[in-house]
């Protein structure tokens, strides 16, 4: 029987190699071979200071595979060097470029410095370089551009320690001062660029409508059109305040809603360093300013203030132990200030304004104390005005202005308040300044 | 499967901010690519609005520049847009996209109205 | 800013039919040019990107030509529901632009 033989056929097929890839300028290709057929692959990586883009769009990595009609499924990128891009502003500063007009690419150095005089940067030495990842990074290692912070505690006075009262203010004596209307005439100080700090008495029957509240700032006579209108985004009163029933806690913090431009007329106060009680002993002299009744009965229509010293806190508490004022009020969280033989004080009207002191060190102005209370008549003999002191609040500013924020945002929308309340029983043994 | 998703409020009252956000499932906004905003006007015309890099850079359209901010959560994989001093202008349908251009939202319908 | 420019707002067509859409760039973007289609109420749906390269799931009688300055939309044998608007976009330079959009309709 013939065996029978089919045939026998060998296929063989050579898929079709795609097109040589060419590596971009300031790229490279991996892995490189002689040729690339079907389902092969090939990666670009750019050289530092370069970046994987399609035309203006950002690739974190890119491949290509090689198809079966011998095409690359991918178009080929390029590997352009980074842009930074234009610089952040910086609020009350400048940026310089360093590198050249306008080169914002690799390696390229920008400045920035503040307005002169009034701010001072924080944060670092303000000079960034646009790195590999295409952010300006400061030699800290920031991202985020500086901070120009006013310049706290500048004023026009000169002072020689004299005691001397009912003075009329000059421009720029008191830049800090702030006029809060809207209940009854308040006071308070301005703290960065847009917060105030007061008495809690003063905004507290405003502390749920704190958009009523009409701030003035810069201004020297007190009926003057010629001032800087601020409007509070959120009022903030201490937790342990607690309205006619002593003025233990007697601070609060306003946030305006907007920051406020600084200049000679309109400069915020210092918050008290570590080292301030050195300024604030007994008989060291601190200054009270405010548009408050005068001797003569009435509001003052220019802002007044009054040079007065710090008196013993023992013989402050014991004055108000006497009576009519028995009831042992002044508390560790206040200071006294004022003269034996009475005359000068501050009264109705001050509520919420700074008592300052110069330090001699740092040649600035700070906060010592807050208007708070006093005798039913202002300046009276062998009583004394008492003031929220400050420095025990320190962290409880900090905090507040940490937590809500440096710049006020502009937005729309009604004032919050923010505090924990428990009200007590009146007591009249003594008055709001 | 990438799938993408806007979000916000409708109706804005003129003068008031925008808000919207994009939630990205199927695929991490840090792993590769630039997440886009682009909007629609009535009448259909579309406007590249900006985006934000898997690294984090942003670009702006400088038509929008000084009211436009794009920013992101990493840890819920959303990007933001917020628009600031919106006017009757700014109504439109948001999308967002990520480019490639492969991957597009279904977009959130915007009225600037008082 | 970049402009794209589909001098025709709309195009008539027929099932069948071969239709081209171009779009004019004011000035040279590369080949980093994408099409899109838009159905009413739905967001623009990707056909090409890089002015040739098709995403992928579209079907292979939409093409993409053209660099430079010049980029045309070729759809071979349409259907009926290729019936739409089409945008060409460049992202090449920043800002990322739009053309103004061509209608597709039936003859």
């Known amino acids: 029987m013939a065996s029978m033989t089919g045939w026998k056929i060998h296929y063989t097929s050579t898929a079709q190699p795609c097109p040589y890839p060419m590596a971009p300028p300031n790229g490279h290709l991996s892995p490189v071979q002689a040729k690339y057929i079907l389902k092969d692959s090939f990666s670009i990586f750019c050289e530092p200071g370069y970046e994987l883009l399609q035309g203006h769009l950002p690739l974190k990595s890119f491949a290509a595979v090689c198809q079966k009609d011998g095409s690359w499924d991918q178009p080929m990128p390029s590997c352009s060097i980074v842009d930074c891009g234009p610089p952040d502003d910086l609020p009350s500063g400048r940026v310089e470029y360093i590198t050249g007009p306008e080169v914002t690419t690799y390696k390229a150095v920008i400045q920035y410095s503040c307005e002169e005089t009034f701010y001072t940067m924080k944060v670092n030495d303000g000079k960034y370089v646009c790195e590999a990842d295409g952010f300006w990074t400061s030699s800290k290692g920031e991202r985020s551009p500086p901070v120009c912070e006013p310049v706290c505690g500048l004023s026009a006075r000169t002072t020689g320690g004299r005691i001397y009262g009912g003075q009329k203010a000059k421009p720029g004596d008191f830049p800090w001062q702030v006029l809060i209307l809207g209940g009854s005439t308040a006071a308070g100080a301005l703290l960065y660029d847009n917060w105030v700090l007061t008495a809690a008495h003063a905004i507290y029957e405003q502390k749920h409508d704190a958009s009523s509240l009409d701030i003035r700032l810069g201004a020297l006579k007190r009926l003057s059109p010629h001032y800087t209108q601020a409007w509070a985004e959120a009022v903030f009163i201490h937790e342990g305040y607690t309205h006619d029933a002593g003025f233990d806690n007697d601070i609060a913090l306003i946030k305006l809603n907007n920051k406020v431009v600084i200049n000679s007329n309109i400069t915020p106060i210092c918050l008290p360093r570590k080292e301030a009680e050195s300024f604030m002993r007994t008989d060291d002299i601190g200054t009270a300013s405010g548009w408050g009744l005068t001797q003569r009965g009435l509001l003052a229509r220019n802002l007044m203030y009054v040079d007065i010293p710090i008196v013993d806190h023992q013989k402050c508490t014991a004055a108000y132990e006497k009576p009519p004022y028995s009831g042992g009020s002044v508390t560790a969280n206040m200071l006294c200030a004022g003269l034996e033989s009475g005359g000068k004080d501050s009264c109705r009207g001050d509520s919420g304004g700074a008592l300052v002191f110069l330090d001699n060190e740092t040649q600035r102005w700070f906060v010592g104390g807050i208007v708070s209370w006093g005798s039913m008549n202002c300046g009276e003999a062998g009583q004394y005005g008492v003031y929220t002191k400050v420095i025990n609040y320190i962290p409880w500013i900090k905090n507040i202005i940490s937590n809500f924020g440096g710049g006020g945002s502009g937005g729309g929308g009604s004032a919050k308040f923010v505090a924990a309340w428990t009200l007590k029983a009146a007591a009249h043994h003594h008055h709001h300044h | 499967d990438v799938q993408l998703q806007e979000s916000g409020p409708g109706l804005v009252k003129p003068s008031q901010s925008l808000s919207l956000t994009c939630t990205v499932t199927?695929?991490?906004?840090?792993?590769?690519?630039?997440w886009n905003w682009i909007r629609q006007f009535p009448g259909n015309k579309l406007e590249w609005m900006g985006y934000?890099?898997?690294?984090?850079?942003?670009s702006y359209n400088p038509s929008l520049k000084s009211r436009i901010s794009i920013t992101r959560n990493t840890s819920t994989n959303q990007f933001f847009l917020q628009l600031n001093s919106v006017t009757t202008e700014d109504t439109a349908t948001y999308f967002c996209a990520r480019y490639w251009g492969d991957y597009w939202g279904q977009g959130t319908t915007l009225t600037v109205s008082s | 800013d970049i402009v794209m420019t589909q001098s025709q707002k709309f195009m008539s067509t027929s099932v069948g039919d071969r239709v081209s859409v171009t779009c004019k760039a004011s000035q040279n973007v590369g080949s980093n040019v994408a099409w899109f289609q838009q159905k009413p109420g739905q967001s623009p749906k990707p056909l090409i990107y890089s002015a040739s390269y098709r995403y992928s799931g579209v079907p292979d009688r939409f093409t993409g030509s053209g660099s430079g300055t010049d980029f045309t939309l070729t759809i071979s044998n349409v259907q009926s529901e290729d019936l739409a608007e089409y945008f060409c976009?460049?992202?090449?330079?920043?800002?990322?632009?739009f053309g103004a959009g061509t209608k597709l309709e039936l003859n």
């Open positions: 976009h460049q992202y090449n330079t920043y800002p990322l632009t």
């Open positions: 199927g695929y991490s906004i840090t792993s590769d690519y630039a």
């Open positions: 934000i890099s898997y690294s984090g850079r942003t």
